[in-house]
């Protein structure tokens, strides 16, 4: 492989690290547009025990600007030193380096739901993966954010054990024939910046006069 | 050699706010935390926060939830930790600790002393 | 958070002898990692803290090899096989497995 100096410093790239389904992924974007690699190359080492870098078998030659590292990356302690390389065909135009904190620079989206909507209550269904690794857990809590006609109002469901398979949970004594939008996010214990997710609604069919009664009591 | 120096000390008025620096040497500034430790008078030692200089990330102790902010400036290799809303209870020498792991501070400044008096 | 308990409080000590001290946490520290984040360091009079220990028993580079470190889960212990004046001072111990990171109170180690 040749390698063309390239006129790029570790600036040439942003990366980011999101908890996306309870998978790592790493995901980069050139500063340079410019630049089109045909392929990128993404290896890494650990900090506290430096050894000769290690080429991410799933992100060797890809043609991806991501990288699932759920499998490689486990401790949220550790920095990750990682190196990513972009090639056009054998030619090397820029190698960028970043180090990585977990514990810090995870940032985490919200996971996937769908609602229901009856007559004086919502059914929220909440997608978590059948099987979450304990690492990958970081203390996170399931907030539900229900909104209508301008009031917000914040739902902490209590999830035994760890953050897996589907879970439902019920938003009730609500208002029929009333208009409601429901955001899910995962909140961190040390309330950093929260991801929320595009906001689903659904409008509550009209109850019966006794029923209407009953829930604008 | 690994150096961390922080800035002089601070006296200042209740309701004000400091901006306490760390400037490192002698390392590559982007590839270790840089952990921030407070000291009062005659006590123990109380974890602030850390902060990801290349990336600007940042984990804060929730007891200093909006107290402290936590910024890098990678260009002069410097760590800064601002203080608001002063009060007594913020009279402390504060410290900044280099870490290749989270919680190593393998290398501590000398400490910035913060006085809080009207 | 996690309480790391430190004793003694106050250690005083002859030149030449041996110092021990024990620091518990309420939890263990063992991370899922498999590594258990909780290091010692030291605190002369008017100075800045210099770590000494880390990993529980790893000894920083220039630290004296009568220091060591050892424990595991909850409880930790730090031993001086035979104390030099240079070695008083305010030992912590501090655990960084679980946030937030959190200090012992510290023991005072003086000459008697």
């Known amino acids: 492989i040749s390698y063309d100096s390239p006129d790029y410093t570790d600036e040439s790239c942003t990366f980011k690290i999101s908890l996306r389904n309870f998978r790592s992924i790493l995901s980069w974007e050139l500063k340079n547009h410019s630049i089109v690699p045909t392929h990128y190359t993404l290896l890494y080492t650990i900090m506290s025990k430096p050894e000769d870098l290690k080429v991410v078998k799933n992100c060797a030659n890809t043609t991806r600007s991501f990288c699932d590292l759920t499998d490689e990356w486990r401790s949220t302690h550790e920095a990750y030193v990682t190196v990513l390389e972009g090639f056009s065909g054998n030619t090397t135009l820029f190698s960028c380096s970043h180090n990585f904190w977990l514990a810090i620079d995870m940032s985490f989206e919200p996971p996937e739901f769908e609602i229901v909507g009856f007559t004086n209550h919502i059914n929220v269904m909440v997608k978590f993966p059948s099987i979450v690794e304990e690492e990958l857990q970081f203390d996170l809590s399931l907030v539900i954010e229900e909104q209508s006609e301008g009031i917000v109002k914040k739902h902490k469901p209590e999830i035994k054990g760890n953050m897996s398979g589907n879970f439902t949970y019920i938003i009730d004594k609500l208002i029929p024939n009333t208009n409601y939008c429901v955001s899910v996010y995962l909140e961190h214990s040390d309330e950093q910046a929260v991801i929320k997710s595009p906001l689903k609604c659904t409008l509550l069919p009209p109850g019966q006069e006794s029923e209407s009664a009953e829930s604008a009591k | 050699q690994v150096q961390l120096q922080q800035s002089g000390g601070e006296l200042v008025r209740p309701g004000t706010s400091v901006k306490v620096s760390c400037k490192a040497s002698?390392?590559?500034?982007?590839?270790?935390?840089i952990e921030w430790v407070k000291q009062r008078p005659g006590q123990g030692l109380d974890w602030i926060g850390m902060?990801?200089?290349?990336?600007?990330?940042?984990k804060c102790n929730k007891k200093f939830k909006g107290k402290v902010t936590l910024t890098a400036d990678k260009s002069s290799s410097t760590a800064y930790m601002h203080l608001s809303s002063l009060t007594s209870d913020d009279s402390a020498v504060y410290f900044c600790?280099?870490?290749?792991?989270?919680?190593?501070?393998?290398?501590w400044g000398q400490g910035t002393s913060v006085t809080v008096s009207s | 958070d996690i309480v790391m308990t430190q004793t003694p409080l106050t250690l005083s000590v002859t030149i030449g002898q041996p110092a021990s001290i024990s620091c518990k946490s309420s939890q263990s520290l063992l991370d899922s990692d498999g590594k258990t984040y909780l290091n010692w360091l030291l605190q002369r009079p008017g100075q800045s803290p210099k770590r000494l220990i880390y990993l529980v028993s790893k000894l920083d580079s220039g630290v004296p090899d009568r220091f060591t470190g050892s424990g595991s889960g909850t409880d930790f212990t730090l031993k001086i096989s035979r104390v030099e004046a240079e070695d008083l001072g305010v030992y912590y111990c501090?655990?960084?497995?679980?946030?937030?990171?959190?200090f012992g109170g510290g023991t005072k180690l003086e000459l008697k």
């Open positions: 600790a280099r870490s290749g792991w989270v919680s190593a501070m393998d290398y």
């Open positions: 002698g390392y590559a500034f982007t590839n270790y935390l």
């Open positions: 902060i990801n200089p290349g990336s600007g990330g940042t």
């Open positions: 501090w655990q960084g497995t679980h946030f937030p990171q959190t």
